[in-house]
Amino acid sequence: GELETSDVVTVVLGQDAKLPCFYRGDPDEQVGQVAWARVDPNEGIRELALLHSKYGLHVNPAYEDRVEQPPPPRDPLDGSVLLRNAVQADEGEYECRVSTFPAGSFQARMRLRVLVPPLPSLNPGPPLEEGQGLTLAASCTAEGSPAPSVTWDTEVKGTQSSRSFTHPRSAAVTSEFHLVPSRSMNGQPLTCVVSHPGLLQDRRITHTLQVAFLAEASVRGLEDQNLWQVGREGATLKCLSEGQPPPKYNWTRLDGPLPSGVRVKGDTLGFPPLTTEHSGVYVCHVSNELSSRDSQVTVEVLDPEDPGKQVDLVSAS
């Protein structure tokens, strides 16, 4: 006869491990008992359980309520046991010793491997600002047994670097993603991908990139000269910029206060029916937490009664 077993039994933390030990013998042979032991390099052999053909299952007190026989129907030649709720400390070598009649004793050893799936965490780096050099965008850490694989999935151009720390029963892997921040990266996903044999599928954590920037400001609204004549209605100046965080807009007049009736609505300056009093230099001030920009325009309202005059447009930033 011979024992059918496995060299390695792999189980995920918290699951039940089946330690296989099946005696393949002649029809007239009987199994009297199967003794299970944990083989520890330091502590030697520690008894785990005994499956006895007459007495039944004995479980060592250290494994009380954790060792069972597989559910019926059971073959009398099957000495397999279930180790419930495997923990990391269960990892190691196990031995089954089968006493048969009349063939004698057989033994086999197997290794129990307990996979500890990682629970990854993603930590964003310091605030990203356009104009910075190579900067940490995010770091991702995952600890497990064996060591997990940590990579990045993104369309953003950058560099990744990994380091690992080995603990007695696990390994922690940290991967960092560095990039040169630009406004085109804003809102782009940066995904940490953790692979591990204890996971049915990769674990993914996505971080949305936020890059602080403020674009140059410009003013639109003076393109059509016919709008800027005395008596015309609906004339507006719009300040153009973009930024992250979204900027705030402020309008002022360089050569005095804003004329009465001129309304400020965020990035837009609205004029009442135009008079020559509305002529002047207007300044759009754009700002966010990162920076501020100015753009100024000179408005001259043309009086149709004075054909010699034309609208003069000067823009400066």
């Epitope: 009297g32 008992q33 005994l50 006895h52 007495y55 299952l57 007190p61 010793r97 006493s99």
Partner: antibody, heavy 126, light 107 residues
């Protein structure tokens, strides 16, 4: 025929010592674990101690741990129980018994006692 | 330690009666249970091992059953030589422990 014969019992004062012997015959002595079981007058059975076939492993009831020592001489087919610091509550008939040999190489469990000696009376009294 | 509780502690019966003695363990012991018979002034004698296996030479009127925590010794038809004290014993753990005994007396 399996035979177990105890000897060495008698009257001893509290704090005294006594050594019990059990001569075995009719079986391969070294192949069997052996036990001592006692029975106080008019009382039930109490397991005292056990020893593996080789003598390498010994086991004791808490009530006698540190005072009693079990041993065996396989060349003489004899089991011993050295009893020190005896107390009145140790008064009992002491039986040696053979453990049934149908569990092999597994020390965590004892086995039934299939053969017993006739017993020897130990009386601890001043 | 595992506690073994026998009931009844004594019983009176007549020759030919069916007698049942029960034994309860304080925790599960699979079938690691033996039954012994002891007559006055004599050593105990193994009757049943592994809860239900009859020891060689023991009359078939003795039988045992149970597993886990509850066990029974049955004498199907009591004979004059069966009047004695009966003990159950667990050997699942060290120390092995005995029940307090059941004395079977003549009615």
């Amino acid at each position: 025929e399996v035979q177990l014969v105890e000897s060495g019992g008698g009257l001893v004062q509290p704090g005294g010592s006594l050594r019990l012997s059990c001569a075995a015959s009719g079986f391969t002595f070294s192949s069997y674990a052996m036990s001592w079981v006692r029975q106080a007058p008019g009382k039930g059975l109490e397991w005292v101690s056990a020893i593996s076939g080789s003598g390498g492993s010994t086991y004791y009831a808490d009530s006698v741990k540190g005072r009693f020592t079990i041993s065996r001489d396989n060349s003489k087919n004899t089991l011993y129980l050295q009893m020190n610091s005896l107390r009145a509550e140790d008064t009992a008939v002491y039986y040696c018994a053979r453990e049934y040999s149908d569990v092999v190489d597994y020390v965590s469990v004892r086995t039934p006692l299939d053969y017993w000696g006739q017993g020897t009376l130990v009386t601890v009294s001043s | 330690d595992i506690q073994m509780t026998q009931s009844p502690s004594s019983l009176s019966a007549s020759v030919g009666d069916r007698v049942t003695i029960t034994c309860r363990a304080s925790q599960g012991i699979s079938s690691y249970l033996a039954w012994y018979q002891q007559k006055p002034g004599k050593a105990p004698k193994l009757l049943i091992y592994a809860a239900s296996s009859l020891q060689s030479g023991v009359p078939s009127r003795f039988s045992g059953s149970g597993s886990g925590t509850d066990f029974t010794l049955t004498i199907s038809s009591l004979q004059p030589e069966d009047f004695a004290t009966y003990y159950c014993q667990q050997h699942y753990t060290t120390p092995p422990t005995f029940g307090q005994g059941t004395k079977v007396e003549i009615k």
